[in-house]
């Protein structure tokens, strides 16, 4: 089935090369050999901030291939994975593992997707099947969301799902993911 073996239930994540060739040794693994940035929102009062807008979180850059059945994108797409705890922007490190990690003693802040973008992708298929054009939804930026004690466990679980790569079989969110084709693609199919 062509690329079927390449694709499993979790989308394969390929570290982006050339960003941080020597990541901090304590975090050297497949999921963290990526560029990390803070959200860049400067705090007014970095040590006693109450405003979510004054918090920032890590935006990890990942590249992955888009698949549709046995077909795979000709090129990988790059998107963000929102990761980790949120803290005052000024205290967050610019790269993973640099500096101390700040943990709030009060409300919990989670790093979740903020904005999304749609991208057209051309997929190549094995066995002479016509190429497929699809659209995918990619995370474009992350934000900190304040969780109070009133948030129940299911909502916490939800944040965990959003913070990770979309997995196969997860429940669809209100936002959606799409596909596209050109006329040549259809004509080739007939």
């Amino acid at each position: 089935q062509g690329w079927q073996a390449f694709k499993n239930d979790a989308t394969e994540i390929i570290p982006e090369l050339g960003e941080y060739p020597e990541p901090p040794p304590e975090l050297e693994n497949n999921k963290t050999m990526n560029r990390a940035e803070n959200g860049g929102r400067p705090p007014h009062h970095p040590f006693e901030t109450k405003d979510v807008s004054e918090y920032s979180c890590r935006e990890l850059h990942f590249t992955r291939y888009v698949t549709d059945g046995p077909c795979r994108s000709a090129k990988p797409v790059t998107e963000l994975v929102c990761s980790g705890q949120c803290g005052p922007a000024r205290l967050l490190p610019n790269a993973i593992g640099r500096g101390k990690w700040w943990r709030p003693s009060g409300p919990d802040f989670r790093c979740i997707p903020d904005r999304y973008r749609a991208q057209r992708v051309q997929l190549l298929c094995p066995g002479g099947e016509a190429p497929r054009a699809r659209k995918v939804r990619l995370v474009a930026s992350c934000k900190c969301k304040r969780l109070t004690r009133f948030h129940n466990q299911s909502e916490l679980k939800d944040f965990g799902t959003e913070a990770a790569r979309p997995q196969k079989g997860r429940k669809p969110r209100p936002r959606a993911r799409s596909a596209k084709a050109n006329q040549a693609e259809l004509e080739n199919a007939y």
Epitope: G69, R117, R132, R134, K135, P172, A176, A179
Partner: antibody
């Protein structure tokens, strides 16, 4: 809330044309493919094609090639399907639908318009 | 062109019954490309299951899907009054194709 609202029922004579509209709200139409599917009375669903509102690129089933034109007006978030040289067997409910983006590596139509009945009769 | 054939075309059942609808595909497709829709009279179709076995948002857990290659099934574990409708399988590779539909009626 995601919605696709279609224009009202039409009665046309054979040989005429019909243009059905589909107004999208609750999402950015440019991010999604819009599909058109029709259903003749008492029959099953028949895919006609789809359009990318972002660039106007469309895909038509060969059966409708030359008779159908799909367009969009992104300023009003509206998709259109025009079918020309109507015949009595074009009498059907015409649906617009959105292809969802949020299902991992799955591609399914997740929201549909309410349908527009087009009756072709002399 | 990939053809989808549903069986049975008509199905009579009672509330509480377990029912299974089969969708046969003319050539093997990936399970990620097979979806199921429910349609009630005078209404637009509604996405029920995507990618063979994944429930769409708001769909009750009594619905389930399975299969691979050329044989796929939709199962309703315990029929409820609101489940009487027409069900369509659909594949999306380079073209969209629907099965002819299975009308589920009250016995």
């Amino acid at each position: 809330e995601v919605q696709l609202v279609q224009s009202g029922a039409e009665v046309k004579k054979p040989g005429a044309s019909v243009k059905v509209s589909c107004k999208a709200s609750g999402f950015n139409i440019k991010d999604y493919y819009i599909h058109w599917v029709r259903q003749a009375p008492g029959q099953g669903l028949e895919w006609m094609g789809r359009i990318d509102p972002d660039n106007g690129e469309s895909t038509y089933v060969p059966k409708f090639q030359g008779r159908v034109t799909m367009t969009t007006d992104t300023s009003t978030s509206t998709a259109y399907m025009e079918l020309r040289s109507l015949r009595s067997d074009d009498t059907a409910v015409y649906y617009c639908a959105r292809e969802g983006l949020d299902y991992g590596d799955y591609y399914a139509v997740d929201y549909w318009g309410q349908g527009t009945l087009v009756t072709v009769s002399s | 062109d990939i053809q989808l054939t549903q069986s049975p075309s008509f199905l009579s059942a009672s509330v509480g019954d377990r029912v299974t609808i089969t969708c046969s595909v003319s050539s093997s497709i990936s399970s990620s490309n097979l979806h199921w829709y429910q349609q009630k009279p005078g209404k637009a179709p509604k996405l029920l299951i995507y990618g063979t076995s994944n429930l769409a948002s708001g769909v009750p857990s009594r619905f389930s899907g399975s299969g691979s290659g050329t044989e796929f099934t939709l199962t309703i574990s315990s029929l409820q009054p609101e489940d009487f409708a027409t069900y369509y399988c659909q594949q999306w590779t380079t073209t969209y194709t629907f099965g002819q539909g299975t009308k589920l009626e009250i016995k």
